[in-house]
Amino acid sequence: FERTRSLQDPCSNCPAGTFCDNNRNQICSPCPPNSFSSAGGQRTCDICRQCKGVFRTRKECSSTSNAECDCTPGFHCLGAGCSMCEQDCKQGQELTKKGCKDCCFGTFNDQKRGICRPWTNCSLDGKSVLVNGTKERDVVCGPSPADLSPGASSVTPPAPAREPGHSPQ
């Protein structure tokens, strides 16, 4: 079948990194500079992606593969193939329509991207709070109160990270 196909279509013999040049009697010609073909048998080469502006080059374009971009510091990739760059926030913040905003009391974000998530509710697992949560960190749950034998010393959790009545943002 392969032999039959190549007799019928000489372009099928053109490997990746080349294209089947109709102007030169269907000879396999190398892709011109700043273009590539990632599969064999192609009649044209694709233009290489240029990583400009807020994008920076993670991998250079070659004759057989497209360039790959990532984002300049302070931004992170979004979308397939890093089609967009989104602003980083600090830990303890989330990105809103009006920019980076602190996590509301009772929520946290330990990354530079994503949304603030509620602190773990230790009591749902029958446990107690060992370490209080902050904007940047989830609470740490400790053993359940019942696990502490009558004479055992319990860990006193530290003071809350914020004053009561802290109004978010």
Epitope: R49, F75, L78, C85, E86, G99
Partner: nanobody, 121 residues
């Protein structure tokens, strides 16, 4: 098609001030954010400030807080970057860009050619 053109760069002494302008043509600034980025020699491009279509300001670089401000004049289709208390480390080519929103940039955004700012005694 939107075009953005920067102006106002130059040589200034440490502690001095400069005001950069970014003029947009081909489309109204009412519908676009405008951001300023900079690139120092041998360093990666970094975000400085951005102003949304509604006037909300985003500071990308902590190092410019309290020294740089951004404002817009929609009637003139121009955004200004006021730079005070300039330091040698502010030396860079400053670029203006017109994304749709300050938080997200794409390859469709329009960038200017840049204006050189040199802070030196």
């Amino acid at each position: 098609e939107v075009q953005v053109v920067e102006s106002g760069g130059g040589l200034v002494q440490p502690g001095g001030s400069l005001r950069l302008s970014c003029a947009a043509s081909g489309s109204s600034l009412d519908y676009s954010a405008i951001g300023w980025f900079r690139q120092a020699p041998g360093k990666e491009r970094e975000g400085v400030l951005c102003i949304s279509s509604s006037g909300d300001v985003t500071i990308y670089a902590d190092s410019v807080k309290g020294r740089f401000t951004i404002s817009r004049d929609n009637a003139k289709n121009t955004v200004y970057l006021q730079m005070n208390s300039l330091k040698p480390e502010d030396t860079a080519v400053y670029y203006c860009v017109a994304p749709r929103i300050c938080s997200t940039y794409s390859s469709d955004d329009y960038w200017g050619q840049g204006t050189q700012v040199t802070v030196s005694s």
